[in-house]
Amino acid sequence: VPEKSVRWCAVSEHEATKCQSFRDHMKSVLPSNGPSVACVKKASHLDCIRAIAANEADAVTLDAGLVYDAYLAPNNLKPVVAEFYGSKEDPQTFYYAVAVVKKDSDFQMNQLRGRKSCHTGLGRSAGWNIPIGLLYCDLPEPRKPLEKAVANFFSGSCVPCADGTDFPQLCQLCPGCGCSTLNQYFSYSGAFKCLKDGAGDVAFVKHSTIFENLANKADRDQYELLCLDNTRKSVDEYKDCHLARVPSHTVVARSVGGKEDLIWELLNQAQEHFGKDKSKEFQLFSSPHGKDLLFKDSAHGFLKVPPRMDAKMYLGYEYITAIRNLREGTCPEAPTDECKPVKWCALSHHERLKCDEWSVNSAGKIECESAETTEDCIAKIMNGEADAMSLDGGFVYIAGMCGLVPVLAENYNTPNPNCENTAEEGYFAVAVVKSSSDLTWDNLKGKKSCHTAVGRTAGWNIPMGLLYSKINHCRFDEFFSEGCAPGSEKNSSLCKLCMGPSPNLCEPNNKEGYYGYTGAFRCLVEKGDVAFVKHQTVPQNTGGKNPDAWAKNLKEEDYELLCLDGSRKSVQEPANCHLARAPNHAVVARKDKADCVQTLLLDQQRMFGSSVTDCSSNFCLFESKTKDLLFRDDTVCLAKLHDRNTYEKYLGEEYVKAVTNLRKCSTSPLLEACTF
């Protein structure tokens, strides 16, 4: 059956031979209605990429550099399956390119000019492409030929395989630049030896190189890693201090109609029957005909790449930046230490309008980018299409797991002028009911619930976390008879109460009328039994404070809070009747942009913050008529975090633990991708 066939692309006679053997052996173990292999032979990996894009083939395994080529238009391929190395219990699908230095030296990443450098080899990922790509815009002009620019940047180097005649400085630390193990400074171990011997000041290698060459921890402690934020970390902190994370070897397919499920079904079956130590007749990860045919010989198996993970996310911002710099050879005109405009991520067109107005008022210091969901915005910040946004704590957690950092906190209670330097304790997550109902925390089963959105703190993580510890399962849509929790599956009972309008029904953005704090409260007013919101929501939307038709006649005393002990209290008593304390919303950004974002926002709030009194004829950053666009409307200021500058420290141990527990109920495709 052609639609059940995976056309594998082979790039040599030897690969084609192995592919045919793969095809025949799979035929013998799979049912006739299962997936099958067909082989397509092409002259090169680039030809395979083009063939897949043109629907003449379906899959090929590529190294990271080629995954980048495959992702570029017009190819638009995406990673679908990753080879893993190491054990099944601790599968490694990536390695980290690092810059290693001796602990007793005192320079940072931005002080490499004039130092001596050790590289694994010319054109190699960890040893050349990544470090030189990231340093590209600091190299002296003209930057072509690249080897000459690098030779003029460092005071001496060992770059195995470089042309020692044309670029003698590149071979200064290893005469002749030998391109094999005859050169003592060749490849990973060689580059590390070059540093260890004192020939060089920095070695560009893989994170595992240090461990492979120094078994003794005391010896490893003599070395450190240079981080991109111009700090240093110990060699075992490579996950938080690397130049780039590099995928090892990846199967790619078309982004649309790419047969990814079929490819996974095929490879999963293949590893079961012909993986490491599985069969004598045919081995997926070795071949008598040559090395690394179709798959790497060192691979131990396959893992399915999460569906939310596109090539940009898979390759990572640093890797793409490095490769793009090298390939395109373009650098910003502004010096790199100058802050470029900050691209704010706006959710749907309501936030985009406010962002556009901000952009005009900021004289272009703020630019705007849009996405339809918070998770899409986070992904855009990760890959550099946007720079920053303000997030509820639940999304600060996801953003943190995806490598972003908190930059400033929204403060709601501290009056100026102390606001900017005050760390607030947070707000209360509460459960609101109508005073006329007889509901308590203990009899919510079968009732109608209203949530700000799935994954948000007050509307989801806190109440559902508490509920989970009571019911011990994740079927929240069965616990409540119906509800509105924007971001739920469209056919779920937790989308039944949502108001839409239609194509936007239950979408986690402002196009859904019951989205956010105000939306969840409106859902309670119009349809629901209980709303999970922040403690300020009822006072902010009653007593005529919200002029919208549905809210203008509401009275605060018509609503009460549910307490965890089964009692109820007035909405004026959240301190004595709440579900938990929630961390304030916070602005997040990529690490490399955090300082610029902070500086710019502090400047912007001085002009457009809560000191502006007349918002009808002036732009106000923290005002959107109860709709919490870009920031919560009750924000007094954006406050510095001081030492709370990681998502764990910002959110606090208790909240992180609660959200981590809820992860077994997670419906976050982005979180799944970021923890791959």
């Epitope: 067109h349 008022n361 004829s617 732009f619 709709k627 666009l629």
Partner: nanobody, 117 residues
């Protein structure tokens, strides 16, 4: 609430010029930010240019150096001078004063600009 009416669009050849006007039914002197947006078929509405009461301006990258936004508070009118027009400038152009609730999806009729040879 001030009503806004756009005019000045039309068919023009590539390289040509047009001047769009947006007349307000009341005073725009106290309105802080005004802007021109455009929407091509099947595309999202996008900001073209904006201007504040103090005269600070912002342009989309695609129109920088070709379009000029200005306002005349005495005449209660917002303008967009469009030079060196390109086929990709073809769209319906709208003006807004941002004074409405961001939530109200209110836009006028707009004015059609077609750049074609």
């Amino acid at each position: 609430e001030v009503q806004l009416v756009e005019c000045g669009g039309g068919l023009v050849q590539p390289g040509g010029s047009l001047r769009l006007s947006c007349a307000a039914s009341g005073s725009i002197a106290s309105i802080n930010t005004m802007a021109w947006y455009r929407q091509a078929p099947g595309q999202q509405r996008e900001l073209v240019a904006g201007i504040t009461r103090g005269g600070s301006t912002k342009y989309a990258d695609s129109v920088k150096g070709r379009f000029t936004i200005s306002r005349d508070n005495a005449k209660n009118t917002l303008y967009l001078q469009m030079n060196s027009l390109k086929p990709e400038d073809t769209a319906v152009y709208y003006c807004t004063d941002f004074s409405r609730d961001y939530y109200q999806d209110y836009w006028g009729q707009g004015t059609q600009v077609t750049v074609s040879s």
